[in-house]
Amino acid sequence: LLVSQGVLLKCQKGSCSNATQYEDTGDLKVNNGTRRNISNKDLCASRSADQTVLCQSEWLKYQGKCYWFSNEMKSWSDSYVYCLERKSHLLIIHDQLEMAFIQKNLRQLNYVWIGLNFTSLKMTWTWVDGSPIDSKIFFIKGPAKENSCAAIKESKIFSETCSSVFKWICQY
């Protein structure tokens, strides 16, 4: 499925709601061309929770959650705090469908911070909610060591130095 910039993916009204923050019309706004063959039906699946969730202005809605894409760049820790200040958290990706949604809404091809870092205490990659990464779903390219934080690029997860500055995504 090739989608040009600005096109709206139509979802069946009543079974799937929009990803924009204004009204439940069943439209998923796409800000960038897709790089994967994820079908319209797939993107609209399992989103009945959207019926009861309305997001703030500037936040996108998908599967009952709200997402905000930054335009500026910060370190991982500064990005983490930025999201906390807005009572949200850095992005936690649950599956490939969510990854596809994120990728469709990224406005550039550069690295973007997500809510995953390597904790020396647990010696493992951990999401900001404390849960471990599911290695059956996601593979992290790069070193697993102290001061490593995760960034996504073209639907892949990379290990980067936490002090590097990238854009980021908040979620609530």
Epitope: Q21, Q56, Y82
Partner: antibody
Framework: SLEESGGDLVQPEGSLTLTCTAS?????????MCWVRQAPGKGLEWIGC????????TYYTSWAKGRFTITKTSSTTVTLQMTGLTAADTATYFC?????????????WGPGTLVTV | AFELTQTPSSVEAAVGGTVTIKCQAS??????LAWYQQKPGQPPKLLIY???TLESGVPSRFKGSGSGTEFTLTISDLECADAATYYC????????????FGGGTEVVVK
Amino acid sequence: SLEESGGDLVQPEGSLTLTCTASGFSFSGSYYMCWVRQAPGKGLEWIGCIYTGSSGSTYYTSWAKGRFTITKTSSTTVTLQMTGLTAADTATYFCARDTGTTNWRYNIWGPGTLVTV
Amino acid sequence: AFELTQTPSSVEAAVGGTVTIKCQASQSIGSDLAWYQQKPGQPPKLLIYGASTLESGVPSRFKGSGSGTEFTLTISDLECADAATYYCQGTDRSSAPTWPFGGGTEVVVK
């Protein structure tokens, strides 16, 4: 609980610093400490907030920027510095704490302190 | 600028009656809205947060509803103690968050 202090009678164009002191908890957690004012017989007016986490970020309403400054001065005190005061700034000033949970809400308020210009 | 418009500014109702107060946001704020009750000489008291969640200890006669830009506070089975001014307060999660209040609604109980 929270308690405001420093309210006083001040001359026009004067300055004043109000202090909000917490008891029973400290500002070591990450949440917002905010200032709200209420002119006599009028409604509540949000002034600004400071995030008590590591960033110490401050946010103000448009009219307060440059004239009002919120600072965390210790683990239990937050101040509101006011300059260029006019008669329109005459009000009861409240400090309030946002809970720090996923929802936004001011669940702890001080009794207020009166500023007269 | 993000603003909240509260209506009516004043409402009168009898004991046992019902009062409805509306709050309109100038932009979508999801469910990030709280309601407060204030009596003369006292600080505001939190009633409802998250648009519809009742604060602990607040009677279930107080009900919040709405999302996006339209919100409502309904007080049923009015009691004399409900005579107060009620304020809505919203939050925007923008790059520079603000927490404005609505103009307030005075509730007079007959």
